[in-house]
Interface confidence: low
């Protein structure tokens, strides 16, 4: 009789087992939930990474969704050519052909009258003639001296295609669109049995106060840096070099008490643009003390060191750096695979299983 459990005791044991099972399941579920925070200065590629997650892990953009980006493609294209023409006045660059001055005026008129999401043959023709002009090209080649979308040449070189009446943006066209992120954009996807919640945050400083203090329980931070920004000035104050602005922000994130136990993944992005730029603009524009060669490998490695050296807890905190091109789906897929493996490894460490 001493060893016999009463019905009440049996029920209590079952309840206890069930609670343990639920706790274990909750723990496993929590371990499988990954909270990723995308940070970085304005126009560093954060939103492009989010778009890539949709393409890679969520079957991409439907035709209907692509159609909705048509107006953004046109707006980006028009803004780009207008920005170049504005800069010609400031930089005192003349049109190669004086007849283009009429086209420039016409551009303003047609752009002002354009219906959103439509590009008339007349407007396309004006843009095409302007883009071909030698003065416009000379000004484009000096784009480090003013603000110009990275996608300017991509769209302007492809005007024949995008100006077609039946034009539907491709996945790549969508990836290249530029819309300033305001507030916080959340995206969810599953990969390698992990449930990712990714938060894209507006990079401009005016947005930062919204997020700097409110992200507890973040698994990892992906910090994006535009490598190609080393020779540009910052859009918001026109004084501080964008790379230095980015380093200042990275310093504040990397050494922040809220992120002591958070993996920091550094995406040195826009490597394709950087590779082209470094041939023409020396790295000393940004780092006067730099004594290395202006080769992609050496200059990129130097920038990597500049960022990694900001880490004040090298003994306990590792920075996982990757060179990326956010508009290249294959590259992002490869890098994100490696990032996920790091997250899994660190998760196992935290659970005492590694």
């Amino acid at each position: 009789m001493g060893c016999t459990l009463s019905a009440e005791d049996k029920a209590a044991v079952e309840r206890s087992k069930m609670i343990d099972r639920n706790l274990r399941e909750d723990g496993e579920k929590a371990a499988r939930e990954v909270k990723l925070l995308l940070l970085g200065a304005g126009e560093s590629g954060k939103s492009t990474i989010v778009k890539q997650m949709k393409i890679i892990h969520e079957a991409g953009y439907s035709e209907e969704e692509c159609k909705q980006y048509k107006a953004v493609v046109y707006s980006n294209t028009i803004q780009s050519i207008i920005a170049i023409i504005r800069a010609m006045g400031r930089l005192k660059i003349d049109f190669g052909d004086s007849a283009r001055a009429d086209d420039a005026r016409q551009l303003f008129v047609l752009a002002g009258a354009a219906e959103e999401g439509f590009m008339t043959a007349e407007l396309a023709g004006v843009i095409k003639r302007l883009w071909k002009d030698s003065g416009v090209q000379a000004c484009f080649n000096r784009s480090r001296e003013y603000q110009l979308n990275d996608s300017a040449a991509y769209y302007l070189n492809d005007l024949d295609r995008i100006a077609q009446p039946n034009y539907i943006p491709t996945q790549q066209d969508v990836l290249r669109t530029r819309v300033k992120t305001t507030g916080i954009v959340e995206t969810h996807f599953t990969f390698k049995d992990l449930h990712f919640k990714m938060f894209d945050v507006g990079g401009q400083r005016s947005e930062r106060k919204k997020w700097i203090h409110c992200f507890e329980g973040v698994t990892a931070i992906i910090f994006c840096v535009a490598l190609s920004d080393y020779d540009l000035v910052l859009a918001e104050d026109e004084e501080m070099n964008r790379m230095h602005e980015s380093m200042k922000l990275f310093d504040s994130i990397c050494n922040n008490k809220w992120f002591t136990d958070t993996s920091i993944i550094l995406f040195l992005n826009k490597k394709d643009l950087f590779e082209e730029k470094i041939k023409k603009s020396p790295l000393t524009i940004c780092y006067p003390e730099y004594a290395g060669s202006n080769t992609y490998e050496e200059a990129a490695a130097y920038i990597q060191c500049q960022f990694e050296d900001l880490n004040k807890r090298k003994d306990t905190k590792e920075i996982y750096t990757h060179f990326t091109c956010a508009t290249d789906t294959k590259n992002v897929q490869f890098v994100f695979d490696a990032v996920t493996d790091v997250i899994i490894k660190n998760n196992l460490k935290d659970c005492g299983l590694f």
């Epitope: 028009i78 803004q79 207008i82 504005r86 005026r105 303003f108 008129v109 752009a111 002002g112």
Partner: nanobody, 120 residues
Framework: EVQLVESGGGLVQPGGSLRLSCAAS????????MNWVRQAAGKGPEWVAS????????DYAHSVKGRFTVSRDNTKNTLYLQMNSLKPDDAAVYYC?????????????WGQGTQVTVSS
């Protein structure tokens, strides 16, 4: 509220002249460069001429250079377009508009227009 009111249009024979006026109100007129823009039936708008805020600099489309003269009177908040040697191709609705730099931002201010007909 910004208002631009054009007047002076009408029917004129080829080779004839017209003087268009644009009365501006609701903004500091002498802070703005101003423009004349026209739109012929079934065609897109076409920039015609512009004048700097204080009237020092003027600029014209090739098609009207030497025939049209843009001027302004900041004391009267009025913009003018003197059109000589008119051709059938000049027939259009003529609008005055604020500086092009505001147009692509969607803050363009255009008047209602005045019709110019050139016909014998």
């Amino acid at each position: 509220e910004v208002q631009l009111v054009e007047s002076g249009g009408g029917l004129v024979q080829p080779g004839g002249s017209l003087r268009l006026s644009c009365a501006a109100s609701g903004f500091t007129f002498d802070d703005y460069a101003m423009n004349w823009v026209r739109q012929a039936a079934g065609k897109g708008p076409e920039w015609v001429a512009s004048i700097s805020s204080r009237g020092i600099t003027t600029d014209y489309a090739h098609s009207v250079k030497g025939r049209f003269t843009v001027s302004r009177d900041n004391t009267k908040n009025t913009l003018y377009l003197q059109m000589n040697s008119l051709k059938p191709d000049d027939a259009a609705v003529y609008y005055c508009a604020t500086d092009p730099s505001t147009w692509y931002r969607g803050t363009a201010h255009w008047g209602q227009g005045t019709q110019v007909t050139v016909s014998s």
